[in-house]
Interface confidence: low
């Protein structure tokens, strides 16, 4: 018996061939011997089966001795043995229809779980293997689960169902809702304007929700909400903003925040959360602000940084075009009785300069100039 696998919602064509290459009498029946369709001369006739409005044949092939049964918009319950009667012969074809669906919305938040459920006909024992867009394989029986979805899981999942040594392939498009970056860090000199950007890693027609930026300043004992906002069809509107600092927010995506001035008291870490309509859970992006200040007080030239720096970052003070006078893995360095000239304060990581601040030291009778 020939086995044919079909996909729920698809169209399948079951073949039936006569030895004579001409149009002759044929009938297709199901396992209950109920007639589905056949011919009367050159006319297509249909029986009382449940497939009535979904069954068809190709009249153009009858003259060649081919009498296919076409079933449209396949359903799991169409799984059956179909019998083609032609030339006093019976050809049997077993049709097995499978469906594969995501248990929830195909738009899922980063970190959530994806469950794929296989619908299969009774008595079948299929195996399923799915391959994620990043090449990860998962295998199982009636259900397959992937926990902790990552951004790279966005895209087309290719799932293959194996039954009776036959294969049928499903493609499911999954969108993982996340920010492009889990975390970012901004380095600024004191007084500079700070731009925070929170680009999303997905595009959808309509995007509605609400968000908030909580900030934990390094100098503060607790975190506080800096801004709350609404998102309606990709339009951003601010609901509430603190007076200090007075953040400004862009009206369009990507989410964009401006801090008028980088000040030591603002240095720290923030967490932007975005709750999307009809989704449980929230999207998160961490943002960090490091602020540098170079000052000269009396005979002491000092350079300081505030904010979340890693232990491997190096802070240096050097006179222009000379070797560093002081270099430490600390958040403050100083030079006593600095020579006159343009001094540079450098924050670097493995030789790469992240932040630079210049301060001009004048001869002792003058006051310092900060460009």
């Amino acid at each position: 018996k020939k086995v044919v696998l079909g996909k729920k919602g698809d169209t399948v064509e079951l073949t039936c061939t006569a030895s004579q290459k001409k149009s002759i009498q044929f009938h297709w029946k199901n396992s209950n011997q109920i007639k589905i369709l056949g011919n009367q001369g050159s006319f297509l006739t249909k029986g009382p089966s449940k497939l009535n409005d979904r069954a068809d044949s190709r009249r153009s092939l009858w003259d060649q001795g081919n009498f296919p049964l076409i079933i449209k918009n396949l359903k799991i319950e169409d799984s059956d043995t179909y019998i083609c009667e032609v030339e006093d012969q019976k050809e049997e074809v077993q049709l097995l229809v499978f469906g594969l669906t995501a248990n929830s919305d195909t738009h899922l938040l980063q970190g959530q779980s994806l469950t794929l459920t296989l619908e299969s006909p009774p008595g079948s024992s299929p195996s399923v293997q799915c391959r994620s867009p990043r090449g990860k394989n998962i295998q199982g029986g009636k259900t397959l689960s992937v926990s902790q979805l990552e951004l790279q899981d966005s895209g087309t999942w290719t799932c293959t169902v194996l039954q009776n040594q036959k294969k049928v392939e499903f493609k499911i498009d999954i969108v993982v809702l996340a920010f492009q970056k889990a975390s970012s860090i901004v380095y600024k000199k004191e007084g500079e304007q700070v731009e925070f950007s929170f680009p999303l890693a997905f595009t959808v027609e309509k995007l509605t929700g609400s968000g908030e930026l909580w900030w934990q300043a390094e100098r503060a004992s607790s975190s506080k909400s800096w801004i709350t906002f609404d998102l309606k069809n990709k339009e951003v509107s601010v609901k509430r903003v603190t007076q200090d600092p007075k953040l400004q927010m862009g009206k369009k995506l990507p989410l964009h925040l401006t801090l008028p001035q980088a000040l030591p008291q603002y240095a720290g870490s923030g967490n932007l959360t975005l709750a999307l309509e009809a989704k449980t859970g929230k999207l998160h992006q961490e943002v960090n602000l490091v602020v540098m200040r170079a000052t000269q007080l009396q005979k002491n030239l000092t350079c300081e940084v505030w904010g979340p720096t890693s232990p491997k970052l190096m802070l240096s003070l050097k006179l222009e075009n000379k070797e560093a006078k002081v270099s430490k893995r600390e958040k403050a360095v100083w030079v006593l009785n600095p020579e006159a000239g343009m001094w540079q304060c450098l924050l670097s990581d493995s030789g790469q300069v992240l932040l630079e601040s210049n301060i001009k030291v004048l001869p002792t009778w003058s006051t310092p100039v900060q460009p």
Epitope: S127, Q129, R131, N137, Q139, G140, G141, C159, L162
Partner: antibody, heavy 119, light 107 residues
Framework: QVQLQESGPGLVKPSETLSLTCTVS????????WSWIRQPPGKGLEWIGY???????NYNPSLKSRVTISVDTSKNQLSLKLRSVTAADTAVYYC?????????????WGQGTTVTVSS | DIQMTQSPSSLSASVGDRVTITCQAS??????LNWYQQKPGKAPKLLIY???NLETGVPSRFSGSGSGTDFTFAISSLQPEDIATYYC?????????FGGGTKVEIK
């Protein structure tokens, strides 16, 4: 780190049944196919068959009448039985984790066990 | 059964040479092809899956290409540790079948 270890008698008499066990450690037997492959001395690789953890099996038609592969998920083991052996069944027998039918390949193998069929 | 024909059956090349092995399937197998390396006395090791995808941890000097019936496996710069027999394997259809193998030696 998943590891596979084949075990069983190294010598089997002609017409008897060859029985081998493959123990899976460092991971679950679930959600994979588990294949048996053999390699006669100085020759190439021949696939014997596989079992899915759910119990679904597929065998090489050339051996189908003589082979049975089974799985014990509680012990994380699979076994191979090959009946009515002859000298032609002398080979190194490997078990391997098979990613399946749509992609992947056999990515984890046991070190193999040598079986000699001789009276 | 699908027959897999590998050629050459053996080859000898110098360290640093580019080495190529071909594998031909008796029917269209799309990209359902794997390549394995087997060193003497050891189990085979998966190098390439889906005809061209490098298995995790496998050096980038190994590569695979092809689709349908004709496939190629290459080592861009042969190293002493690459002395082994290489096998192709199809999994488009059961039974799974292997090529006869190509023994690679150093000149």
């Amino acid at each position: 780190q998943v590891q596979l270890q084949e075990s069983g008698p190294g010598l089997v008499k002609p017409s008897e049944t060859l029985s081998l066990t493959c123990t899976v450690s460092g991971g679950s037997i679930s959600h994979y196919y588990w294949s048996w492959i053999r390699q006669p001395p100085g020759k190439g690789l021949e696939w014997i068959g596989y079992i899915h953890y759910s119990g679904t099996t597929n065998y090489n038609p050339s051996l189908k009448s003589r082979v049975t592969i089974s799985v014990d998920t509680s012990k994380n083991q699979l076994s191979l039985k090959l009946r009515s052996v002859t000298a032609a069944d002398t080979a190194v027998y490997y078990c391997a984790r098979d990613q399946g039918f749509s992609s992947g390949g056999m990515d984890v193998w046991g070190q193999g066990t040598t079986v000699t069929v001789s009276s | 059964d699908i027959q897999m024909t590998q050629s050459p059956s053996s080859l000898s090349a110098s360290v640093g040479d580019r080495v190529t092995i071909t594998c031909q399937a008796s029917q269209d197998i799309s990209n359902y092809l794997n390549w394995y390396q087997q060193k003497p006395g050891k189990a085979p090791k998966l190098l390439i899956y889906d005809a061209s995808n490098l298995e995790t941890g496998v050096p980038s000097r190994f590569s695979g290409s092809g689709s349908g019936t004709d496939f190629t496996f290459a080592i861009s710069s042969l190293q002493p540790e690459d002395i082994a027999t290489y096998y192709c394997q199809q999994y488009d259809n059961l039974p799974l079948t292997f090529g006869g193998g190509t023994k690679v030696e150093i000149k």
